[in-house]
Interface confidence: low
């Protein structure tokens, strides 16, 4: 004869908390370490499963399909479910009945996305959204990879992506004294770097790199160099180019400079030589298939000039240089030096020698190019 | 020009694991793609994987994920595929081929290897 | 996953005539397909590239033509060396697929 269950039979309701699409084992243990009857019943004593016999059975719940039990475990008297792909709505109270008890388990099940795509541009805003069930008043606080804190409840919001929050984000859903973890893959579509310098002798070879910060598996777009030369009054399109499958292809190119790109990642453009008309300001940009706005380079190139003309040694330099910049001349293995921090610099009757110009910053030498002066003999007067 | 050299014909009992090798001249590793494709006896080519040394990324046909792993020796400059786990539906000839033409994509299969044949039997 | 669907399987042909080999697309791939060439025993051939564009090399008797779903390779002028399988790839988006190929034998 079965009896019945009393109200002091009834254990107390443990909380547990699930993750959308997650898998999850609610646990029940018999007294004894045997195998026994057992059901699993929601709260409204629709039976889930059970054994009958020594076969693991289904009730007529929409958790028929993805509820499970661990039978190698029962003989030692543990009756867990297993509920896998969790939904919000199987957040319920759970009742497993074993020897004549009951013991009730109140999963709540949770989920964290992202209201738009995961990867984003630079400046982007990104908003994670939770998703709970009713009557839950869980709290939010997610970590970026770069360390910064941020708390919500059913919304957390970072108004504008940097670079450094590329990354695992690791957020933590709380709710009666219970966490749950959800790590959220982001990805900062951003060059590597906002802006770079380059700095190169006259006739030199000047190499531009644009590395991006992050790796797609296909990547597809088309970008463009504006160049705005120190000299020139407007700014002008240098090339413009396709990416396709991480591939390179040029559309079109300007004539002077005729710049060539690498046909692979990363980008890569090639100026054949310095020279001080091309000295300047650029922005390269890049707009991604499937993406709003585009990504963003700044490249500058500084020029240097040395040249002697008759009594005068000069030594110049073009493109867009900071004031605390010091141009330098100075006759090697000699203390003579004449230094700047202008965009020219002079030296009228240089000695003889070998002469070096630098472009230093804070003792730091930048760009360095060398002349040899050779010593002028002065013309005899005919008789 | 590229050229591939494939590893010779194994014979693999079921459960065992594979290792074919694609050695390559006329460039070096580091700078090319290398994908792997197989046909089985009867059946049409299937892209298996693809390694890509630019940034160092594996990307695998679902199919196969879990069982097959690209390597590359860059000092010999030989690519390898590792199958586990083998079925007797892996019998297969095994190829590599690979982006080895400046002037076409990167990704490209331009270049291909001979083929090495695997048979799993018990 | 694109399925790639080539036909026909097999085909038989006498020199000097004119075969068309069909491949097509389960969704759009652009001009995003290279036809390849393998004889027994050797190499594939990379013969036509982004659907229309010949290989430098490859002997212009080739052709290739179609863009988005349906694609053609022509063999014009048909010479006894071209008996061999020939083969489709889409190479629009990963995983990469192939069509079934087609056998050419030459009478």
């Known amino acids: 004869e079965q009896k019945l269950i009393s109200e002091e039979d009834l254990a107390a309701k443990k909380v547990v908390l699930g993750k959308k699409g997650d898998t999850v084992e609610l646990t029940c243990n018999a007294s004894q370490k045997k195998n026994t009857q057992f059901h699993w019943k929601n709260s409204n004593q629709i039976k889930i499963l059970g054994i009958q016999g020594l076969f693991l059975t289904k009730g007529p719940s929409k958790l028929s399909d993805r509820a499970d039990s661990r039978k190698s475990l029962w003989d030692q008297g543990c009756f867990s479910m297993i509920i896998k792909n969790l939904k919000i709505e199987d957040s319920d109270t759970y009742i497993c009945e074993v020897e004549n008890k009951k013991e009730e388990v109140e999963l709540l099940v949770f989920g964290l996305t992202a209201n738009s795509d995961t990867h984003l541009l630079e400046g982007q805003s990104l908003t994670l959204t939770l998703e709970s069930p009713p009557g839950s008043s869980p709290s939010v606080k997610c970590r970026s990879p770069g360390g910064k804190n941020i708390q919500g409840g059913r919304t957390i919001s970072v108004p504008q992506l940097e670079r450094q929050d590329s990354g695992t984000w690791t957020c933590t859903v709380s709710q009666d004294q219970k966490t749950v973890e959800f790590k959220i893959d982001i990805v900062v579509l951003a060059f590597q770097k906002a802006s770079s310098t380059v700095y190169k002798k006259e006739g030199e070879q000047v190499e531009f790199s644009f590395p991006l910060a992050f790796t797609l598996e296909k990547l597809t777009g088309s970008g463009e160099l504006w160049w705005q030369a120190e000299r020139a009054s407007s700014s002008k399109s240098w090339i413009t180019f396709d990416l396709k499958n991480k591939e390179v292809s040029v559309k079109r190119v300007t004539q002077d400079p005729k710049l060539q790109m690498g046909k692979k990642l990363p980008l890569h453009l090639t100026l054949p030589q310095a020279l001080p008309q091309y000295a300047g300001s650029g922005n390269l940009t890049l707009a991604l298939e499937a993406k709003t706005g585009k990504l963003h380079q700044e490249v500058n190139l500084v020029v240097m000039r040395a040249t002697q003309f008759q009594e005068n040694l000069t030594c110049e330099v073009w493109g867009p240089t900071s004031p605390k910049l010091t141009l330098s001349l100075k006759l090697e293995n000699k203390g003579a030096t004449v230094s700047k921090q202008a965009k020219a610099v002079w030296v009228l009757n240089p000695e003889a020698g070998m002469w070096q110009c630098l472009l230093s910053d804070s003792g730091q030498v930048l760009l360095e190019s060398n002349i040899k002066v050779v010593p002028t003999w002065p013309t005899p007067v005919q008789p | 020009q590229v050229q591939l050299v494939q590893s010779g014909a194994e014979v693999k009992k079921p459960g065992a694991s594979v290792k074919v090798s694609c050695k390559v001249s006329?460039?070096?590793?580091?700078?090319?793609?290398m994908h792997w494709v197989r046909q089985a006896p009867g059946k049409g080519l299937e892209w298996m994987g693809i390694f890509d040394p630019r940034d160092g990324q594996i990307i695998y046909a679902e199919k196969f994920q879990g069982r097959v792993t690209v390597t590359e020796d860059t000092s010999t400059d030989t690519a390898y595929m590792e199958l586990s786990s083998l079925r007797f539906d892996d019998t297969a000839v095994y190829y590599c081929?690979?982006?080895?033409?400046?002037?076409?994509?990167?990704?490209?299969?331009?270049?291909w290897g001979k083929g090495t044949t695997v048979t799993v039997s018990s | 996953e694109t399925t790639l669907t080539q036909s026909p399987a097999f085909m038989s042909a006498t020199p000097g005539d004119k075969v068309n080999i069909s491949c097509k697309a389960s969704?759009?791939?652009?001009?995003?397909v290279n036809w390849y060439q393998q004889k027994p025993g050797e190499a594939a051939i990379f013969i036509i590239q982004?659907?229309?564009t010949l290989v430098p090399g490859i002997p212009p008797r080739f052709s290739g033509s179609g863009y988005g779903t349906d694609f053609t390779l022509t063999i014009n002028n048909i010479e006894s060396e071209d008996a061999a399988y020939y083969f489709c790839l889409q190479h629009d988006h990963f995983p990469y697929t192939f069509g079934q190929g087609t056998k050419l034998e030459i009478k």
């Open positions: 969704q759009d791939i652009d001009d995003d």
């Open positions: 982004e659907a229309t």
């Open positions: 081929a690979t982006g080895g033409n400046e002037d076409y994509y990167f990704y490209y299969m331009d270049v």
């Open positions: 006329g460039h070096t590793l580091t700078e090319l793609s």
